[in-house]
């Protein structure tokens, strides 16, 4: 008799999830010599231990503490780049500007990027059929709690000037419900962080509006100012040129506004 299985609204665990996490862990230690002390088997055990045999709507930040401990990593606190709804460009940027880091450039973010996972209460099985959706099922699911946990720590580590890349093509350029808006903004430490600098990325080639005047950006400025952190904002009108100028800052065309 087939066992009854809870059907969730979201996609199931990414196929070959354990193998992917282990392979990414090994790859990360290859790219980052300072992390070669990392024991990838222990990392996988800690990752698995956070959600296996647990109800996928009842996951806590505490469940991820063993993994967080294993993935502890020093990042230059003044070189942090946050992003919201514009991951690909943020990652392209840090691939060029090697001294700046997004969460996905850190071990734990690198391991989990673009993956989905969940288990089932009281069984050691990984659920490859479906996982809880944040809106339709529950917010305390393994993936959401993971990103909340690591995003909070990442924001807490930041100092001096923190940069955030925002998508100017969205109706809400700053979204209070995004991870940036709901977690990272509130975990920047005013005693360490002097300024949050927003880079608003324009989508249309002919878009010359000052998106720093957008009401949602003003809302972000208000939240940040109330936390005793200064706020500044820049329009990135030409993201392609922006990346090109990061690669080749000496280029004569890079002195004009991008």
């Amino acid at each position: 008799v087939p066992r009854w299985r809870q059907q969730w609204s979201g996609p199931g665990t990414t196929k070959r999830f354990p193998e992917t996490v282990l392979a990414r862990c090994v790859k990360y230690t290859e790219i980052h010599p300072e992390m070669r002390h990392v024991d990838c088997q222990s990392v996988w055990d800690a990752f698995k231990g956070a959600f296996i045999s647990k109800h996928p709507c009842n996951i806590t930040e505490e469940d991820y503490q063993p993994l967080v401990k294993l993935g502890t990593q020093t990042v230059p606190c003044n070189k942090i780049l946050l992003w919201s709804r514009i991951k690909d460009l943020a990652h392209q940027f840090t691939q060029v500007q090697r001294d700046m880091f997004t969460l996905e450039d850190m071990l734990l973010g690198y391991l989990a990027d673009d993956l989905t996972w969940c288990g089932e209460f009281n069984t050691s099985k990984i659920n490859y059929q479906s996982c809880p959706d944040w809106r339709k099922d529950c917010s305390n699911n393994p993936v959401s709690v993971f990103w909340k946990t690591v995003s909070r720590r990442f924001a807490e580590a930041a100092c001096d000037v923190v940069h955030v890349m925002l998508n100017g093509s969205r109706s809400k350029i700053f979204d209070k419900n995004s991870t940036f808006g709901s977690v990272e903004v509130h975990n920047l430490q005013p005693e360490k962080v002097q300024t949050l600098e927003a880079w608003v990325i324009h989508g249309g080639r002919e878009d010359s509006r000052d998106l720093c005047q957008d009401p949602t950006i003003k809302e972000l400025e208000s939240i940040i100012s109330k936390r005793n952190i200064q706020f500044s904002c820049k329009n990135i009108y030409r993201p392609d040129k922006f990346l090109q100028c990061v690669k080749n800052p000496e280029d004569s065309s890079c002195t004009s506004e991008i």
Epitope: E30, P33, H37, D39, C40, S42, P66, K69
Partner: antibody, heavy 121, light 107 residues
Framework: QVTLKESGPTLVKPTQTLTLTCTFS??????????VGWIRQPPGKALEWLAH???????RYNPALKSRLTITKDTSKNQVVLTMTNMDPVDTATYYC?????????????WGQGTLVTVSS | DIQMTQSPSSLSASVGDRVTITCQAS??????VAWFQQKPGKAPKLLIY???YRYTGVPSRFSGSGSGTDFTFTISSLQPEDIATYYC?????????FGQGTKLEIK
């Protein structure tokens, strides 16, 4: 089949420099993710890690001995060389080389048979 | 440096006995502990890594457990060929450090 073998002098005088060679087969340091380390064991005593080197020339040393140690590799000869300066009788020990592999932290899985080095005038 | 304190330093047991050796780390090493067997005049042999993973080809009578600072190595049924000195090692951080060893003898 991975094998490692240590070679070098059996006797060195105090203040001299010791040079040990680890020659290996079934393992290539031109392959990503591989490394070789050195460990020593004074007679009747515990093991002490000295240094290791990765395929990409990333090196790690025991801080207590760092000023005296140099680890290098010759990929074409399948060899790793450890030099230890200013030898003292307390450095008398069996010296082992061992393989390490990326992702396993610093777990040493294959070991050489060891070579006994005596420091005496 | 992380100190690895192993106990007992020596132990005598009979064939078929269950033998337990403990190792305490001076700070949290999560699960990054390996166990080695060394016979006289021979190189150490890896038995267990990452606290509880049996290395390839190691008999199932050998097992390891623990996390944080306290680790245990067990031989479920002692065999004559198990007579050796056993070492724990933390592979969590540099410098890698070993316990002082436990010499196992047959009664």
């Amino acid at each position: 089949q991975v094998t490692l073998k240590e070679s070098g002098p059996t006797l060195v005088k105090p203040t001299q420099t010791l040079t040990l060679t680890c020659t290996f087969s079934g393992l290539s340091l031109s392959t990503s993710g591989k490394g070789v380390g050195w460990i020593r064991q004074p007679p009747g005593k515990a093991l002490e890690w000295l240094a290791h080197i990765w395929w990409d020339d990333d090196k790690r040393y025991n801080p207590a001995l760092k000023s005296r140690l140099t680890i290098t590799k010759d990929t074409s000869k399948n060899q790793v060389v450890l030099t230890m300066t200013n030898m003292d009788p307390v450095d008398t020990a069996t010296y082992y080389c061992a393989r390490i592999e990326l992702g396993r932290s610093y777990v040493m899985d294959y070991w050489g048979q060891g070579t006994l080095v005596t420091v005496s005038s | 440096d992380i100190q690895m304190t192993q106990s007992p330093s020596s132990l005598s047991a009979s064939v078929g006995d269950r033998v337990t050796i403990t190792c305490q780390a001076s700070q949290d090493v999560i699960t990054s502990v390996a166990w080695f067997q060394q016979k006289p005049g021979k190189a150490p042999k890896l038995l267990i890594y990452s606290a509880s993973y049996r290395y390839t080809g190691v008999p199932s009578r050998f097992s390891g457990s623990g996390s944080g600072t306290d680790f245990t190595f067990t031989i479920s049924s002692l065999q004559p060929e198990d007579i050796a000195t056993y070492y724990c090692q933390q592979h969590y951080t540099i410098p890698l450090t070993f316990g002082q060893g436990t010499k196992l003898e047959i009664k």
